[in-house]
Amino acid sequence: RQQWELQGDRRCQSQLERANLRPCEQHLMQKIQRDEDSYGRDPYSPSQDPYSPSPYDRRGAGSSQHQERCCNELNEFENNQRCMCEALQQIMENQSDRLQGRQQEQQFKRELRNLPQQCGLRAPQRCDLEVESGGRDRY
């Protein structure tokens, strides 16, 4: 049993290393920036995010392309809830430094939680997304 779990753990690690989660990060960043645009951005806090969407992306086509690529990547974790959780936490960690303020962080987290469902996948059950950057040791 333990041996099987160690093998499963290694498989998850290699899956995570192979996965390109960047499209997920781009899709989520564009999504929350589009939401900010619809609700009106603070004119005194221009976006400094490197993923700031182009006018083409703002119409949604670029983002839907990112979403499709993102879902393809997440699909690899469909049969491993723990690994799905790891992937989502990795996305959260990668973006935590780029999120400006508590509100944007909460918005990003909300969209991240909905991501598996948007991809037609099952959301992980025991999965804490309240991740602090740099605060966790790896499996």
Partner: antibody
Framework: EVQLVESGGALVQPGGSLRLSCAAS????????MTWIRQAPGKGLEWVAN????????DYLDSVRGRFNISRDNAKSVLYLQMNTLSADDTGVYYC????????????????WGQGILVTVSS | QSVLTQPPSVSAAPGQKVTISCSGT????????VSWYQQLPGTAPKLLIY???KRPSGIPDRFSGSKSGTSATLGITGLQTGDEADYYC???????????FGGGTKLTVL
């Protein structure tokens, strides 16, 4: 008011069997995970087993897997723990608890506990 | 030997603040939610904190929970003699597919 009442505790010989029951009331039993937790005399808490709302998934402490079986009767709002091949290490107070675990992005937590029932394994 | 490590005992005077730590690994606290329980002598445990920081209704705001990395902390302010009890942390461990409890911490109010 949520109530969990355990029964079936006894003094049993090593190698023997026992079935604990937990009658639940005051909440919709079929919508909650349920959990057994035990505490050896003078020791800390030890999780024993979880069962999903519909009984389709069960998790066990390694040392009881294959000997204990957790089950539930949602029509009667009763949780069970069938314990076989008992040893002195299984001695303690067994608590029936309601587990707040949800379907996604949630953790196990035990928001209601029974009063506990004593199981003693001794010759 | 519990996989979640808590100090065996802590003590403080009435009115003071105390913190109880719970240390784990990436496969438990690092990825999962932590809950905290109070067990008064001779009684069943009671839930104090769940999902790292949330308090069930009826639990005073003197009790607080936090989590950072692979450690969690229970804070109790305005200590009262009635807080003398054993305190336990708990979380799911993905390696073991099991809920783990810490070894427990005995709080003495001097």
């Amino acid at each position: 008011e949520v109530q969990l009442v355990e029964s079936g505790g006894a003094l049993v010989q090593p190698g023997g069997s026992l079935r604990l029951s937990c009658a639940a009331s005051g909440f919709k039993f079929s919508t909650f995970y349920m959990t057994w937790i035990r505490q050896a005399p003078g020791k800390g808490l030890e999780w024993v087993a979880n069962i999903k709302q519909d009984g389709s998934e069960k998790d066990y402490l390694d040392s009881v897997r294959g000997r204990f079986n957790i089950s539930r009767d949602n029509a009667k709002s009763v949780l069970y723990l069938q314990m076989n091949t008992l040893s002195a290490d299984d001695t303690g107070v067994y608590y029936c608890t309601r587990n707040g675990l949800q379907d996604s992005y949630s953790g196990d937590f035990f928001d209601h506990w029974g009063q506990g029932i004593l199981v003693t394994v001794s010759s | 030997q519990s996989v979640l490590t808590q100090p065996p005992s802590v003590s403080a005077a009435p009115g003071q603040k105390v913190t109880i730590s719970c240390s784990g690994t990436g496969s438990n606290i690092g990825h999962n939610y932590v809950s905290w329980y109070q067990q008064l002598p001779g009684t069943a445990p009671k839930l104090l904190i769940y999902d790292n920081t949330k308090r069930p209704s009826g639990i005073p705001d003197r009790f607080s929970g936090s989590k950072s990395g692979t450690s969690a902390t229970l804070g109790i302010t305005g200590l009262q003699t009635g807080d003398e009890a054993d305190y336990y942390c708990a979380t799911w461990d993905a390696d073991l597919s099991a809920v783990l409890f810490g070894g427990g911490t005995k709080l003495t109010v001097l």
